[in-house]
Amino acid sequence: KSSNEATNITPKHNMKAFLDELKAENIKKFLYNFTQIPHLAGTEQNFQLAKQIQSQWKEFGLDSVELAHYDVLLSYPNKTHPNYISIINEDGNEIFNTSLFEPPPPGYENVSDIVPPFSAFSPQGMPEGDLVYVNYARTEDFFKLERDMKINCSGKIVIARYGKVFRGNKVKNAQLAGAKGVILYSDPADYFAPGVKSYPDGWNLPGGGVQRGNILNLNGAGDPLTPGYPANEYAYRRGIAEAVGLPSIPVHPIGYYDAQKLLEKMGGSAPPDSSWRGSLKVPYNVGPGFTGNFSTQKVKMHIHSTNEVTRIYNVIGTLRGAVEPDRYVILGGHRDSWVFGGIDPQSGAAVVHEIVRSFGTLKKEGWRPRRTILFASWDAEEFGLLGSTEWAEENSRLLQERGVAYINADSSIEGNYTLRVDCTPLMYSLVHNLTKELKSPDEGFEGKSLYESWTKKSPSPEFSGMPRISKLGSGNDFEVFFQRLGIASGRARYTKNWETNKFSGYPLYHSVYETYELVEKFYDPMFKYHLTVAQVRGGMVFELANSIVLPFDCRDYAVVLRKYADKIYSISMKHPQEMKTYSVSFDSLFSAVKNFTEIASKFSERLQDFDKSNPIVLRMMNDQLMFLERAFIDPLGLPDRPFYRHVIYAPSSHNKYAGESFPGIYDALFDIESKVDPSKAWGEVKRQIYVAAFTVQAAAETLSEVA
């Protein structure tokens, strides 16, 4: 059968029908429904929501909707023994204690089961000692402290401001520096936009607001007790001492009112420069310890959280493909939230719900997609991407053979300024072409395309007249699909005009104030940005599932490979003496990129010319496109990170949220001047160049004529 026979409707009409069926009012209703009570992973409330979504997806018309459950390690505060931080005097008396909960927002005073702010997976402990302020606790912040300022964090409790990098990296850095505890806080410089009121009168963080979040360093492992395998009924679980990625020191988050009380007494060294100062009326002294009058006072942490193996539930919906049912296009986003999830995740889940409803409406009218579409409502994303990772581990053999693409659907908005897209280069042209067909929701761009407003507000730094598309990092549910399995992936959402604050999140991120009203009053009253994101995510899924030839352009991979090779070369050449001494050559990598470019170009020519009515040849060409992303996977993984297997992209070793290109070479070069054995270090650089060059060449050969 041709695609059009199978689907009963002409392709253009299909896409238009699908997009026209998406309604802002429905997304609004779904968001309201999903945000009235907390849906913390592992709780009864989140199980009930899973069953509700299962039931509604069935009503919408999906062929099947199943729950997939796993028993994974989660973390909760002790209900009778709360976590807090004290300032203690020389007699050990607590003269100041941090708050035990966030003041609830108006209308939510009587809601039960609001989990108090905590750092998920913190070990228990009651360390006490002097405080050291470590700025954002980034790698470079600890370099500044230890190397330039000669400040030793060993045996100290460090206080770090949230922002710039994933909180788990902050904790890892503090551990490596010898700290015995970590206090995380939200500084107004990062979480209070000038000229905006704090919630409930605006979208800024109030002084009592606190960001929850996990502090794991899983590196893609999923459930800490069952790395590489699903946490099913017969799973063998590691002992807690062998669990992957757990922090070894107590950690706790606080708001800026409480942070003020700790930081105002700080003594010791002055901040090294203005980049270490936030917006509180405190000196931002680094320490260690408190100033003169308060020098005998110490800080004490009281952490009593517990790690518990708990059942979680994914919802998996299937819309069977009419022509290629064994090719899967996946749309997935998480359902679990820290509290109400007004933005994270329910602004995304509401969009997925409306996309499912629209697809279901078309199916009821007799249409089917060419390829199978899988819809997923993931559980326990907030606890380390656990639901998506366990499901992918359970289904890895199917996914690696049949997975065409994965589109992520967490928060639809983190602002209302312009579109933000992170994706594989294979999807660049798909995103460009789709956004040219969609209307911009932006003020001042009436009658203009989304592509036009996006390009104007977020231009590409390299190509004029094109929008910025970023590399995929991690910190969301696409991780296992892209970084471990090599399935082409992408994500899209509306964002803020705040490039310098890219990884800090919106002010109320993971706080109790992330409510339906936050979205409805301040971010998107008409839900027009949500609708646009639904059109982008849904449109991508539609095209990936329905186009006769997969909408992947391998030439765009060639362009970025050359750019990434140039960048890593320039980093390496900053060490010319060692490059010369150890005769480090990039010939193999540049040669491989050249070959990839030529072969991709020839493949694209053949793609234009082949007989699309021949189903065997069509399937062959599509398989070459589908498997190209897979060809960048190294089965051995990256050094010390076996579940990050993509050779071109990995989450940065210094910030899980950010993507790094040629990560193996990058990490081998990082801080290489401090390595004790330069010969060994430069040998590893050469090995990583070899691995990268081989992988690029091998990937190129998958695009060559098959015989």
Epitope: K563, M573, D587, F590
Partner: nanobody, 112 residues
Framework: EVQLVESGGGLVQPGGSLRLSCTVS????????VSWVRQAPGQGLEWVSA???????YYADSVKGRFTISRDNSKNTLYLQMNSLRAEDTAVYYC??????WGQGTLVTVSS
Amino acid sequence: EVQLVESGGGLVQPGGSLRLSCTVSGFTFSSYAVSWVRQAPGQGLEWVSAIGAGGGTYYADSVKGRFTISRDNSKNTLYLQMNSLRAEDTAVYYCAKDGADWGQGTLVTVSS
């Protein structure tokens, strides 16, 4: 055999300009990133600038805003335009493909 041959060095006064060239052979120039590296008298090697196969440019902080790297793929030639020269720019300037392939260098002396 890979060859890189620098030219254009010489004596120039502080504040003056100079343009270095590097003609290459033995490899497909357009497909490779190339660099300028210098060595001041009695000092180690210092990376100055690189230009990628894609044309992207990279500079050491010490020369940013004063030096411009460029390439002409049709002539297999790499250039370094050096403006606002200072005494501390005095060095032998090498054209380098990577750690394995280097030119012989050309001397730049900045002195009044």
